[in-house]
C-alpha cells in the first residue's frame, strides 16, 4: 500500500484582519492509526494551534466531521484573525503511540499573511 | 478546576539566581502556551515571558531578556522562571498565567510568589 | 508597540451607582481587549474577553463595549466586594503582551 502523503493544497492565503481563514489539509491513507496536529511555524518553537485529541482551542474549527471513521479531511478554521496569527501552518500527521504519539509525516504548510482591516 | 500554584520564591541579594516553579492541574497543560507577569509593589502588571505549548518558543520582555529564562516540562505539568543576575528593580509578586489558546488572552492566574531582591 | 492608558486612576462610586472606566489603545487591537480584576491581595482573576464577553462565573453587572482603540468596562450596579483595580490587556500585537496602568475602584 502506497505511503500516507499529507497534502496542503494552497501554498499561501491572505485574509483580512478580523475575517476567518481555512485551512485545508487532507491525507491520503488512514493508515498509521494516530491523530492529526495543527502548527504554526515549525521546528522546536512551533505553537500548537490544533490537536485533534486534546486541549480546547476555541478560535479552531474542523470542516468536516472528524469522528466520522473514514475522514480524511482534517482542513481548520481560525476565526477572528489577527496580525499575530500571520506565519506558515503546517497540517502534522501523527502515529499513534504510547505514552506519546510520534510525528510520521507533514504537509509541506501553507503561509498565511494578514490584511489590514478593511476601513 | 484549573489551578496554578507558584513556590521558589524567597529573598535574595543583588547578583544572585533564585527559581520559580508553577505546578498545574485541572487541564490539559501540555496543550497550552504559558506565561510569568509580575507586580511590583504598589505598581501594575508588567508582563515578564511566555512559552509556547511545546516549550521550544519563548519570548522575554526587554527588562529580563539575558537573564531570565522560561522553561516547562509537560511531563510534570509544571512551568520554571529561572532568575539569574537578580536586581533590586525585580522586586515583586510573580504571576504564572494560563493563556486560552495560543494567541490570546490569559484566562486564569496563579496566586503569585514574591521574590524581594535586597542587599 | 501598543501602548494602553486606562482612565481614570481612582474611581470612587456610591454602592448601586454605574461605574464606567475607560482604556484606550495607541493603535487598534480590533476586539482583542480583555479586563482583569484584582482585588487586594489577590491574583488578577479575568473579568471580560474579546471587549465584550463576560468570564466564566462573571456577575453580569460586569460588561464590556468598544473596539479598534476605546473600550469601555461597566459595572452597572456596583457591590462592595467590587472594590478592586481593574487593568485592560490586549492581545492583538504581540510580544510583549501590555496592560494598562489600572484604574483602583473605590465603592464609598
Known amino acids: 500500500e502506497e505511503e500516507l502523503q499529507v497534502i496542503q493544497p494552497d501554498k499561501s492565503i491572505s485574509v483580512a484582519a478580523g475575517e476567518s481563514a481555512t485551512l485545508h489539509c487532507t491525507v491520503t491513507s488512514l493508515i498509521p492509526v494516530g491523530p492529526i496536529q495543527w502548527f504554526r511555524g515549525a521546528g522546536p518553537g512551533r505553537e500548537l494551534i490544533y490537536n485533534q485529541k486534546e486541549g480546547h482551542f476555541p478560535r479552531v474549527t474542523t470542516v468536516s466531521d472528524l469522528t466520522k471513521r473514514n475522514n480524511m479531511d482534517f482542513s481548520i478554521r481560525i476565526s477572528n484573525i489577527t496580525p499575530a496569527d500571520a506565519g506558515t501552518y503546517y497540517c502534522v500527521k501523527f502515529r499513534k503511540g504510547s505514552p506519546d504519539h510520534v510525528e510520521f509525516k507533514s504537509g509541506a504548510g501553507t503561509e498565511l499573511s494578514v490584511r489590514a482591516k478593511p476601513s | 478546576d484549573v489551578q496554578l500554584v507558584e513556590s521558589g520564591g524567597g529573598v535574595v541579594r543583588p547578583g544572585e539566581s533564585l527559581r520559580l516553579s508553577c505546578a498545574a492541574s485541572g487541564f490539559s497543560f501540555r496543550s497550552y502556551a504559558m506565561n510569568w507577569v509580575r507586580q511590583a509593589p504598589g505598581e501594575g502588571l508588567e508582563w515578564v515571558s511566555r512559552i509556547n505549548s511545546g516549550g521550544g518558543g519563548t519570548d522575554y520582555a526587554d527588562s529580563v531578556k539575558g537573564r531570565f529564562t522560561i522553561s516547562r516540562d509537560n511531563s510534570k505539568n509544571t512551568l520554571y522562571l529561572q532568575m539569574n543576575s537578580l536586581r533590586a528593580e525585580d522586586t515583586a509578586v510573580y504571576y504564572c498565567a494560563k493563556q486560552y489558546d495560543w494567541n490570546s488572552f490569559f484566562d486564569y492566574w496563579g496566586l503569585g510568589a514574591l521574590v524581594t531582591v535586597s542587599s | 508597540e501598543t501602548v494602553l492608558t486606562q482612565s481614570p486612576a481612582t474611581l470612587s462610586v456610591s454602592p448601586g451607582e454605574r461605574a464606567t472606566l475607560s482604556c484606550r489603545a495607541s493603535?487598534?487591537?480590533?476586539?482583542?481587549l480583555a479586563w482583569h480584576q484584582q482585588k487586594p491581595g489577590q491574583a488578577p482573576r479575568l473579568l471580560i474577553y474579546?471587549?465584550?464577553n463576560r468570564a466564566t462565573g462573571i456577575p453580569d453587572r460586569f460588561s464590556g463595549s468598544g473596539s479598534g482603540t476605546d473600550f469601555t468596562l461597566t459595572i452597572s450596579s456596583p457591590q462592595t466586594e467590587d472594590s478592586a483595580v481593574y487593568y485592560c490587556q490586549q492581545y492583538y500585537y504581540w510580544p510583549p503582551y501590555r496592560f494598562g496602568g489600572g484604574t483602583k475602584v473605590e465603592i464609598k
Open positions: 493603535q487598534t487591537v480590533g476586539s482583542k
Open positions: 474579546d471587549a465584550s
